[in-house]
Interface confidence: low
């Protein structure tokens, strides 16, 4: 019998260029008579054009929703009702070809063609894209607040904020033909729930979404987004009601930046330069294609690419890369944004050089990608360290911390976190090395103490990049480096001339002169430590809540001992900058560190002095007794302490702590406390210092109070941010 054919709705969106009409400002106002009249004519023309082709039998509905420059561009959508089996056949490309064919067939025709009655449509200016019913609904919901803007070359146009009576608005942006649009979004409030979506076409087509941002992001206070060409749409969806725009939008046309380079690297190791996507740090555009060719001077070297918060991964199946596709030596890799550093090491087997391609495979893009490139020695990629094949990084080996995710850097160590005697491979503790007392059989621990040695896990790197064998040589009153750099920046870590914390005792004035109290509206929230004349270090999680993210809220007190009273040695500061570690992850507490820049430099006194910062190679030996200080609760769940408390805690081996916390302890964490509990940090101590006293009498910052299970509980140690694990970021910011 007769079987009804299943029909489906296929939605298309597009634009066409009219050569015999000109755009006018009237056409940007939907309520104007000019807009209504032009829309009626354009709708008629569009319908006639479609019905003049084989598509006519499938025509369902259409709408012209906007106009733009060029001389006049009409933006439209239409729906065809088509048999299901023809769905794939009538792709946007096929539909565009049919319409263009129709337009071309009548260009020189003298016969009357209905759709050419008023409009001369440019066949080359017709664009048809795939859309969906959902896209049209999204577009229609913005039409009550629809703004068209043309931005000329050399112009930066600040867009008018949304209409707060509307729940959704659309900015339709257009620039000169051969340029690309760059949109800048700046969040101006600390908190909001607004949502903005940027599209690579004139309307909100989901398949052409470049990116969407939500709720006054602290991670990205400024976002710059590139379109692939001269058209873009931005859709705003209202969050909480606000009389103030929580963002500022501006747009400018920019020229296409070539992303191709040929480089020959020098005969030296380490970073030699930077490759980046066009207009970095802007988001890369949806049709980015970069091709970098690097020539390596000799086959002794491999090429290293060092990424920041971005990694390359092999896709097990041929799925598209959603965060950038890379091809390196014909190997396909996908980019992935991560909160970790990463290096890709490329073995070089031919002098022809290496070609690296980066492509945005889909319209969805992301933050621009920057990569440092350089050489490494193929026969010894990580001198004195371990090459972590999981992430391509050189990490310290056998230092008691599993820096490599698979832990291979700590496997099968003859001497873990100790010095290996040359004579018989016996292990001695690091403080015994270069201490003037031979401990190894033939005294190999006291050899080469006055000369440079190859750099390794526990060697100290001097400013001239040479290394010394003596562990922890900083600020011990004796120059060990040829350039004396181990004794520079040593005005730190000394206590004042002075004679909460669970299980602690009250501190005296000047005893911990680096201790900071971070307060909001007169209330102590977190601890911190002074590390330089204008910088205080604390935990990133202190600013976790959006309401705590603004610098204006915070006051920093130094030289303070009592919370309920002031004394002459006490000073206060406002905060001019707040920087969270870029890899900080709230859920895991990883990289739990933040830096506060004070509004003016400190004047050093007996009560206000910085603590010493350790070098990356500084070794805080497990078992060592160190001190934590703060005004935190004196018992779990209790109120904060009035007096600054101090308590000694023991440093715990990483593997033991990791076991207790079921392997949630990362290499940026350090544990301290006691198996039996009792002495520990507590609520309100967060961000405060864990300090250890060196043989020189100076105090070095080993950790920051970060997290733990309860306070002082048996078998649960306190977990601290490991300063040696984040020191390179601290130094980069502070210097």
């Amino acid at each position: 019998g007769y079987k009804a054919e299943v029909m489906v709705s296929q939605v298309y969106s597009g634009s066409l260029r009219v050569l015999n009409r000109h755009f006018s400002q009237d056409l940007t106002r939907r309520e104007s008579s000019a807009f209504r009249s032009e829309t009626a004519k354009a709708q008629k023309m569009l319908k006639e054009l479609i019905t003049s082709t084989r598509l006519g039998t499938y025509y369902n509905s259409s709408s012209v929703y906007s106009f733009g420059e060029g001389p006049l561009t009409c933006f439209f959508w239409f729906i065809l009702q088509i048999p299901e089996h023809r769905r794939l056949m009538l792709s946007p490309e096929v539909v565009q070809a049919l319409l263009v064919e129709e337009l071309l067939s009548t260009v020189n025709s003298s016969a009357a063609v209905p759709y050419r009655a008023e409009y001369e449509v440019d066949p080359e200016g017709l664009v048809i894209l795939e859309a969906s019913v959902k896209d049209i609904a999204a577009l229609n919901s913005t039409l009550g607040c629809y703004r068209y803007s043309y931005v000329g070359q050399g112009q930066v146009l600040r867009l008018k904020g949304p209409d707060h009576l509307a729940s959704s608005c659309l900015w339709h942006l257009q620039g000169p033909k051969d340029l690309m649009l760059k949109l800048r979004l700046e969040w101006t409030l600390a908190e909001c729930r607004d949502r903005l979506a940027m599209y690579d076409v004139a309307g909100p087509l989901e398949k052409r979404l470049i990116t969407s941002v939500y709720g006054c992001s602290r991670q990205e206070p400024v976002v710059e987004v590139l379109a692939s060409g001269a058209i873009m749409a931005v859709v705003w969806k209202k969050g909480l009601h606000s009389y103030y725009d929580p963002f500022v939008l501006s747009v400018q046309p920019v020229v296409f930046q070539a992303c191709e380079v040929n480089l020959t690297l020098d005969n030296r190791l380490d970073s030699q330069g930077v490759l980046s996507t066009p207009y970095f740090p802007s988001y890369y555009s949806p049709q980015t294609h970069c091709s970098w060719h690097l020539t390596v001077p000799s086959l002794d070297y491999g090429l290293a690419l060092w990424f920041d918060a971005y990694a390359l991964r092999r896709q097990k199946y041929d799925l598209p890369c959603t965060q950038g596709q890379w091809t390196i030596q014909n190997r396909r890799l996908c980019g992935l944004r991560i909160l970790q550093p990463y290096a890709e090491r490329i073995p070089v087997v031919a002098t022809a050089g290496i070609t690296i391609n980066f492509t945005s495979q889909i319209s969805l893009t992301g933050p621009g990608v920057r990569v440092h490139y350089g050489l490494y020695n193929q026969s010894d990629p990580c001198p004195g360290e371990f090459l972590c094949s999981v992430n391509g990084l050189c990490v310290p080996a056998c230092d008691g911390v599993k820096d490599c995710p698979n832990g291979l850097d700590e496997r099968n160590c003859v001497c873990r976190a100790t010095f290996q005697c040359k004579e018989d491979s016996t292990c001695i503790s690091l403080p015994k090395v270069c201490d003037g007392q031979p401990d190894c059989l033939n005294g190999s621990d006291e050899e080469q103490c006055q000369e440079g040695v190859p750099c390794g896990t526990f060697t100290f790197q001097c400013e001239d990049r040479s290394c010394v064998k003596k562990p922890n040589p900083q600020c011990d009153g004796r120059p060990d480096c040829r350039d004396g750099s181990d004794e520079e920046h040593c005005d730190c870590g000394l206590q004042g001339p002075s004679s909460r914390i669970v299980g602690g005792a009250v501190s005296s004035e000047g005893e911990w002169p680096w201790q900071a109290s971070l307060q909001v509206r007169g209330r102590h929230i977190c601890g911190g430590a002074l590390i330089a004349d204008r910088w205080v270090i604390t935990a990133a999680h202190c600013f976790q809540e959006d309401s705590m993210a603004s610098t204006v809220l915070w006051t920093v007190f130094l030289g303070k001992v009592w919370q309920n009273s002031r004394w002459p040695g006490e000073v206060s500061f406002k905060v001019s900058r707040l920087l969270l570690h870029p890899y900080h992850e709230e859920d895991s507490h990883d990289y739990d560190v933040a830096l506060l820049q004070l509004d003016h430099p400190v004047v050093r006194s007996a009560a206000v002095r910085p603590v010493c910062l350790p070098a990356r190679s500084h070794f805080f030996e497990p078992g060592l007794h160190c001190w934590i200080t703060g005004w935190g609760a004196l018992r779990e769940g209790g109120p904060i302490s009035n007096a600054l408390q101090k308590v000694d805690v023991q440093l715990i081996p990483q593997d033991l702590c990791s076991e207790v916390y079921r392997y949630q302890v990362t290499p940026r964490m350090l544990c301290a406390g006691y198996r039996k509990g009792k002495k520990d940090a507590c609520q309100g101590d967060s961000g405060g210092p864990l300090v250890c006293k060196a043989l020189s009498g100076r105090w070095f910052l080993a950790g920051l109070v970060s997290w733990g299970l309860g306070c002082g509980r048996p078998n649960y140690f306190g977990v601290y941010t490991r300063i040696t694990g984040v020191i390179s970021w601290i130094q980069q910011v502070v210097t």
């Epitope: 491999g302 092999r314 097990k316 090491r345 073995p347 193929q378 026969s379 010894d380 990629p381 990580c382 371990f386 090459l387 094949s389 999981v390 080996a397 698979n406 832990g407 291979l408 850097d409 496997r411 099968n412």
Partner: antibody, heavy 122, light 108 residues
Framework: QLQLQESGPGLVKPAETLSLMCTVS??????????WGWIRQPPGKGLEWIGS???????YYNPSLKSRVTISVDTSNNQFSLKLRSVTAADTAVYYC??????????????WGQGTLVTVSS | SYELTQPPSVSVSPGQTARITCSAD??????AYWYQQKPGQAPLLVIY???ERPSGIPERFSGSSSGTIVTLTIRGVQAEDEADYYC???????????FGGGTKLTVL
């Protein structure tokens, strides 16, 4: 063409230490791209991975054998060795040295020696 | 300890298709590799990364992966394909190499 050649005694007494050497030709052990390892196969049975080593000396072992195994490297002679302590009759097997491609998601053995039979018997 | 499970034996007539399976929990995350071992010889890698064939391996050998099961397929089996076949992968951390128990392929 890469070749691996095992050498060592074919007979070891119980409780003693089994020692084998693998000589690599056609590639440098110090190539930063590969691990080098040992696999064994008891007569009539399946394959068992013993452990692998990176040229820098970093090693990792099958957890079931870890307490008895040492794999070490001699880069100057392009050789690596296996020591298995306190052997019993259960350690009688053909021992293969292999090149272990263990980079990123890869984890396989692309070149094998021809194998050497070691019998544990008094 | 982590294990890969294979059938002990598979028999097939010449010209037919042989399928050997291997299952384990980590296989969706870790690649599988297949080795052929003939009597008195060292194993030979015939499939790597689930489905890729090293150069020199005949096209009749192919591999596939679906969830926790990987399959070695030999189409148009020949007498010379009679051998033991071992699948190999890694534990879920990617640290340790693990072999299946092996499958004896008999060509009838």
């Amino acid at each position: 063409q890469l070749q691996l050649q095992e050498s060592g005694p074919g007979l070891v007494k119980p409780a003693e230490t089994l020692s084998l050497m693998c000589t690599v030709s056609g590639d440098s052990i110090s190539s930063s791209h590969y691990f080098w390892g040992w696999i064994r196969q008891p007569p009539g049975k399946g394959l068992e991975w013993i452990g692998s080593m990176y040229y820098s000396g970093s090693t990792y072992y099958n957890p079931s054998l870890k307490s008895r195994v040492t794999i070490s490297v001699d880069t100057s002679n392009n050789q690596f060795s296996l020591k298995l302590r306190s052997v019993t009759a259960a350690d009688t097997a053909v021992y293969y040295c292999v090149r272990h491609n263990n980079w990123g998601l890869d984890n396989y053995f692309d070149y094998w020696g021809q194998g050497t039979l070691v019998t544990v018997s008094s | 300890s982590y294990e890969l499970t294979q059938p002990p034996s598979v028999s097939v007539s010449p010209g037919q298709t042989a399928r050997i399976t291997c299952s384990a929990d980590a296989l969706p995350d870790q690649y599988a590799y297949w080795y052929q071992q003939k009597p008195g010889q060292a194993p030979l890698l015939v499939i790597y990364k689930d489905s890729e064939r090293p150069s020199g391996i005949p096209e009749r050998f192919s591999g596939s992966s679906s969830g926790t099961i990987v399959t070695l397929t030999i189409r148009g089996v020949q007498a010379e394909d009679e051998a033991d076949y071992y699948c190999q992968s890694a534990d879920s951390s990617g640290s340790y190499a693990v072999f299946g128990g092996g499958t004896k392929l008999t060509v009838l």
